[in-house]
């Protein structure tokens, strides 16, 4: 299921129109597309151009992150007169052109979405040959990937004075709320660091001091679901070691 956010000021689409009315480049992309991790999403992009009936060589490109300079994730090339845009690049094989560039459509399908795909994407078309021109969406389309929580790491670590602390890291979008439960804890939100810088979908919760032996459970929850994982602490009493 894919949701396309409606921008009321531009009625569904960001329309970038350039040049004089008689001959102009324009690109139409929605501000945002939402889809769930594991699913597929379609990034719509259509364009108009000033080169009437152009049928020369063309290249269609999608890049991620920033316009003009972001890394390419998809590229295809169509020979003069051909409607077939032959894929030259499809990052991890997950990107596929749905539209027909000859018909001014660069729409792209992204398969097997992951949280890492949550970024802005920019479509671009280049004409080569007699006509020599190019144009790229400057605003792009934000792909918003949602995901149920997943606990990526749970561990017990030594801390000063022969004590122990527990860490739980989960990912999800929206970022999940984390709670610890365990001996003499009840339900504790503990110390939550959320989200980690540079890891927008990761949330970490810490139990700074584990005072009792037993099972400690971390629960991650967001609007799409919940996940839990446990860790066990058993200390050899009278010794400085512990078994987890």
């Amino acid at each position: 299921f894919v949701r396309t956010k409606i921008d009321t000021t531009e009625n569904l689409l960001n329309t970038e129109v350039h040049s004089s009315p008689a001959q102009r480049w324009s690109m139409q992309v929605p501000p945002e597309v939402s889809a769930e991790a594991g699913d597929a999403a379609v990034l719509p992009c259509t364009f108009t151009h000033p080169h009437r009936h152009y049928d020369g060589p063309l290249t269609a490109i999608w890049r991620a992150g920033e316009p003009y300079a972001g890394p390419q994730v998809f590229r295809c090339a169509a020979a003069r007169g051909s409607e077939l845009c032959q894929t030259a690049l499809s990052l991890h094989g997950r990107f596929r052109l749905l539209g027909n560039p000859r018909r001014n459509d660069l729409s792209l399908r992204v398969e097997r979405l992951a949280l890492a795909d949550d970024r802005r994407y920019f479509c671009r078309v280049e004409f080569a040959g007699d006509v020599h021109d190019r144009y790229e969406s400057r605003h792009g389309v934000r792909l918003h990937v949602t995901a149920a929580p997943r606990i990526v790491n749970i561990s017990v670590l030594p801390s000063p004075a022969h004590a122990f602390r527990a860490l739980c890291t989960a990912e999800g979008e929206p970022p999940p709320a984390l709670a610890w439960s365990g001996p003499a804890l009840g339900n504790s939100l503990a110390a939550v660091r959320s989200p980690r810088e540079g890891h927008g979908h990761l949330v970490t919760a810490e139990l700074p001091a584990l005072t009792h032996d037993g099972r400690y459970t971390c629960t991650a929850a967001n609007s799409l679901g919940r996940s839990e994982a446990s860790v066990y602490l058993f200390r050899f009493h009278g010794a400085s070691g512990a078994s987890t």
């Epitope: 040049s19 060589p57 890394p71 590229r75 020979a79 030259a88 040959g129 400057r138």
Partner: antibody, heavy 118, light 112 residues
Framework: EVQLVESDGGLVQPGRSLKLSCAAS????????LAWVRQAPTKGLEWVAS????????YYRDSVKGRFTISRDNAKSTLSLQMDSLRSEDTATYYC???????????WGQGTLVTVSS | DIVMTQTPLSLSVTPGASASISCRSS???????????VFWYLQKPGRSPRLLIY???NLASGVPDRFRGSGSETDFTLKISRVEAEDVGIYYC?????????FGSGTKLEIK
Amino acid sequence: EVQLVESDGGLVQPGRSLKLSCAASGFTFSDYYLAWVRQAPTKGLEWVASVSYDGITNYYRDSVKGRFTISRDNAKSTLSLQMDSLRSEDTATYYCARQDWEGGFAYWGQGTLVTVSS
Amino acid sequence: DIVMTQTPLSLSVTPGASASISCRSSKSLLHSPGLTYVFWYLQKPGRSPRLLIYRVSNLASGVPDRFRGSGSETDFTLKISRVEAEDVGIYYCGQLLENPFTFGSGTKLEIK
């Protein structure tokens, strides 16, 4: 770090051929157009040729059309310029450059001197 | 072909002073709003050219903010404030709007 390293040029007689190559590293080679730009001794910069991402489309300045061939090998990250029917006016330092379109000729090689003389 | 005309051909500047180089194109280099295909390069003596400014006014990576590009359509300016000894060399403007891609004839900057 982006690096472009041209092969050695040399002295060649008018009418003869020479092939230049340029080894690239530090970036995703196939994501960019590449170009050759030359500079005659004590003169300014002159664009020679450009090649598209997959080597399908080439552009040349009129004075080298039909004599020069630009090509690329994406598997080896190399750019080439085959120069045939060389003329004395082709004498120049040849630079390979990464052509970023909206970012200009963003990176340049160290240049290699080609002298066409009998 | 688009002709890029640079002025002056050379200029001599006192360290700490500012310098200004003009570039005029024979055709508008404005492709679409916010997208003008004009660039500035510096070639230091015995070295390869280096990109200074892209799309009129954007500073290339590692270029000090003493360099500033401005202009529109057909008239462009590179201004260097607080000129330093390391700024000597030949400055070129160039266009990537149309094939053949062309450069200005260069402006030689010297230090007094």
